[in-house]
């Protein structure tokens, strides 16, 4: 697993470097999670042919994965810092149940899956400190999440492999959009 942000050898070698700003820390955290997702996607694509499957659209309709839309204010046109930040935090909170689902889906990258999950929790904390309008952020209902987890695990092997692939792909896209938006804040 990659070394978490702030613990790499460069930081040790440069003790006089300025401490990271809040925005730099968030940026670095997202890039770290994206590296982890790449490693997990590699295992998924090697293990099955999901990455070339034409049945993605069918399966994707059955997963209510967070997605950036124009109204969320995260795109260059119609950019709105506060609305966008709320969307990023809400989306990450919604992704948590899917990251929990991923925990038992990997053989050789088990630690990597755990690292992505824990780093996302840390990222949410960073972003919550940055957000002023925390009242607008809705936390997913634990009972609903438990039900969703069971439903995902009730699928057959092929559907679970497809679900894993779609979660990783959607989470990567969501984080990339978030990274671009946060760099404008």
């Amino acid at each position: 697993a990659p070394v978490p942000p702030g613990e790499d050898s460069k930081d040790v070698a440069a003790p006089h470097r300025q401490p990271l700003t809040s925005s730099e820390r968030i940026d670095k955290q997202i890039r770290y999670i994206l590296d982890g997702i790449s490693a997990l996607r590699k295992e998924t694509c090697n293990k099955s042919n999901m990455c070339e499957s034409s049945k993605e659209a069918l399966a994707e309709n059955n997963l209510n994965l967070p997605k950036m839309a124009e109204k969320d204010g995260c795109f260059q046109s119609g950019f709105n810092e506060e609305t966008c930040l709320v969307k990023i935090i809400t989306g990450l909170l919604e992704f948590e149940v899917y990251l929990e689902y991923l925990q038992n889906r990997f053989e050789s990258s088990e630690e990597q899956a755990r690292a992505v999950q824990m780093s996302t929790k840390v990222l949410i904390q960073f972003l919550q400190k940055k957000a002023k309008n925390l009242d607008a952020i809705t936390t997913p209902d634990p009972t609903t999440n438990a039900s969703l987890l069971t439903k995902l695990q009730a699928q057959n092997q092929w559907l679970q492999d497809m679900t894993t692939h779609l979660i990783l792909r959607s989470f990567k896209e969501f984080l990339q959009s978030s990274l671009r938006a946060l760099r404008q804040m």
């Epitope: 929990e100 889906r105 069971t150 679970q160």
Partner: antibody, heavy 115, light 110 residues
Framework: CQSVEESGGRLVTPGTPLTLTCTVS????????MSWVRQAPGKGLEWIGI?????TTYYATWAKGRFTISKTSTTVDLRITSPTTEDTATYFC???????????WGQGTLVTVSS | AQVLTQTPSPVSAAVGGTVTINCQAS????????LGWYQQKRGQPPKYLIY???TLASGVPSRFKGSGSGTQFTLTISDLECDDAATYYC??????????FGGGTEVVVK
């Protein structure tokens, strides 16, 4: 090779609690939900309940209070709280939820409830 | 309670013929496609045929075809073989992780 096997079926008298066990191999119970299904002699399939990889349970309306599903790392148990003659059936364990799951089944274990 | 109603039962056709089995849900199945079909022969556990309403399970011949969404589903078996004689069940998943089977349809091959 992925497989499931039921055990524990036997002749019991009405009211005597009975626990059936489903032993899995070749896959992890933390990744898959598991269902219990029964079939009375000459009748159709009847879904009893399901337990998720994280231990959450859901039951058919008619089965609530009559059955309890629990699990360990390699087994899933079905406890028949207070069997009646109507519970005489072959009990199957299946991986996942019937429909989009239910891809691997055991051979079943026969429970006979009689006085 | 969630109910799946299968019709007709029994159904019979000659070798090489076609049979169609219908399955109607009392409410929409989860994601409109959480529905599968199983084949069961006497003394055996059910065999997985179709999932997601229309996707063939591994090793199932293309003579078996599933269709439908929401509340109405169909299993069609074409080019009937003697070995297709069995009871067929539809099974659906509903909101809140509740599952159900249809009553079963016996297929007789003449």
């Amino acid at each position: 090779c992925q497989s499931v096997e039921e055990s524990g079926g036997r002749l019991v008298t009405p009211g005597t609690p009975l626990t059936l066990t489903c032993t899995v191999s070749g896959f992890s119970l933390s990744s898959y939900a598991m269902s219990w299904v029964r079939q009375a002699p000459g009748k159709g399939l009847e879904w009893i309940g399901i337990i998720g990889g994280f231990g959450t349970t859901y039951y058919a309306t008619w089965a609530k209070g009559r059955f309890t599903i629990s699990k360990t790392s390699t087994t899933v148990d079905l406890r028949i709280t207070s069997p009646t003659t109507e519970d005489t059936a072959t009990y199957f364990c299946a991986r996942g939820g019937p429909g989009n799951g239910g891809d691997i089944w055991g051979q079943g274990t026969l429970v006979t409830v009689s006085s | 309670a969630q109910v799946l109603t299968q019709t007709p039962s029994p159904v019979s056709a000659a070798v090489g013929g076609t049979v169609t089995i219908n399955c109607q849900a009392s409410q929409s199945v989860d994601d409109n496609n959480w529905l599968g079909w199983y084949q069961q022969k006497r003394g055996q556990p059910p065999k997985y045929l179709i999932y997601s309403a229309s996707t063939l399970a591994s090793g199932v011949p293309s003579r078996f075809k599933g269709s439908g969404s929401g509340t109405q589903f169909t299993l069609t078996i074409s080019d009937l073989e003697c070995d297709d004689a069995a009871t067929y069940y539809c099974a659906g998943g509903f909101s809140g992780n509740i599952f159900a089977f249809g009553g079963g349809t016996e297929v007789v091959v003449k």
